[in-house]
């Protein structure tokens, strides 16, 4: 159980004050108006690996 607002969220997630919880930025596609999505816009998702050299 995370103390409110203390630990930073892992990459690809952002803090929701509304839910008192780190939330997965991927869910912003379905719910773009969630409060944590602003933090997702500021921190782009982890880079993907190319499948070829």
């Amino acid at each position: 159980e995370q103390a409110p607002g203390t630990a930073p969220c892992s990459r690809g997630s952002s803090w929701s004050a509304d839910l008192d919880k780190c939330m997965d930025c991927a869910s912003c596609r379905a719910r773009p108006h969630s409060d944590f999505c602003l933090g997702c816009a500021a921190a782009p998702p982890a880079p993907f690996r190319l499948l070829w050299p």
């Epitope: 995370q2 607002g5 004050a17 839910l19 008192d20 869910s27 108006h33 969630s34 409060d35």
Partner: antibody, heavy 123, light 111 residues
Framework: QVSLKESGPGILQPSQTLSLTCSFS??????????VSWIRQPSGKGLEWLAH???????RYNPSLKSRLTISKDTSRNQVFLKITSVDTADTATYYC???????????????WGQGTSVTVSA | DIVLTQSPASLAVSLGQRATISCRAS??????????MHWYQQKPGQPPKLLIK???NLESGVPARFSGSGSGTDFILNIHPVEEEDAATYYC?????????FGGGTKLEIK
Amino acid sequence: QVSLKESGPGILQPSQTLSLTCSFSGFSLSTSGMGVSWIRQPSGKGLEWLAHIYWDDDKRYNPSLKSRLTISKDTSRNQVFLKITSVDTADTATYYCARRGPDYYGYYPMDYWGQGTSVTVSA
Amino acid sequence: DIVLTQSPASLAVSLGQRATISCRASKSVSTSSYSYMHWYQQKPGQPPKLLIKYTSNLESGVPARFSGSGSGTDFILNIHPVEEEDAATYYCQHSRELPWTFGGGTKLEIK
């Protein structure tokens, strides 16, 4: 259609442990963003939020009661539980469970509530 | 904890007139983009019913005579025109931080 229903012992004695069950239908607690809260209301008085459990089993408690509260869930049975230890007459109230769930605009406040279960603590 | 103070504690409004209920928070429940304030209606023997979420967004099925406004520490619930079925107790609630707290309630009587 979403519905929630609370059940409890009705009457119990001081120092005992209160066990409450919230049985729900119409949504799944395995859905990302979903959660269930417990709220209580002494007769003729206001509302007090007690605890919340999330789809991923993360839990939150009201600090003023945290040492006495335990919230848990059985996702497969669509049930959420609350235990309050060492009850006193001040715990006499109607206890509600309520859902917080995701929608397009973000996350609902408590949008669906059960009818409540009355609990009396009396010697 | 954020304390929510509602005023008045009770009010009587004539049918068809405007009811205004205030909710003041002990500290801001808003950010630059969000106001985490919600309003509920409770009738005797019933659970609370969500009316307005995030300050001004009407819950589905709630009549348009209900409206909410405000930011920071000061919020308002307006009902206009008031109807008989609006007789109830109204509560504000915030979700800005834990613990989520409710106002003490405002009892609305229809004259």
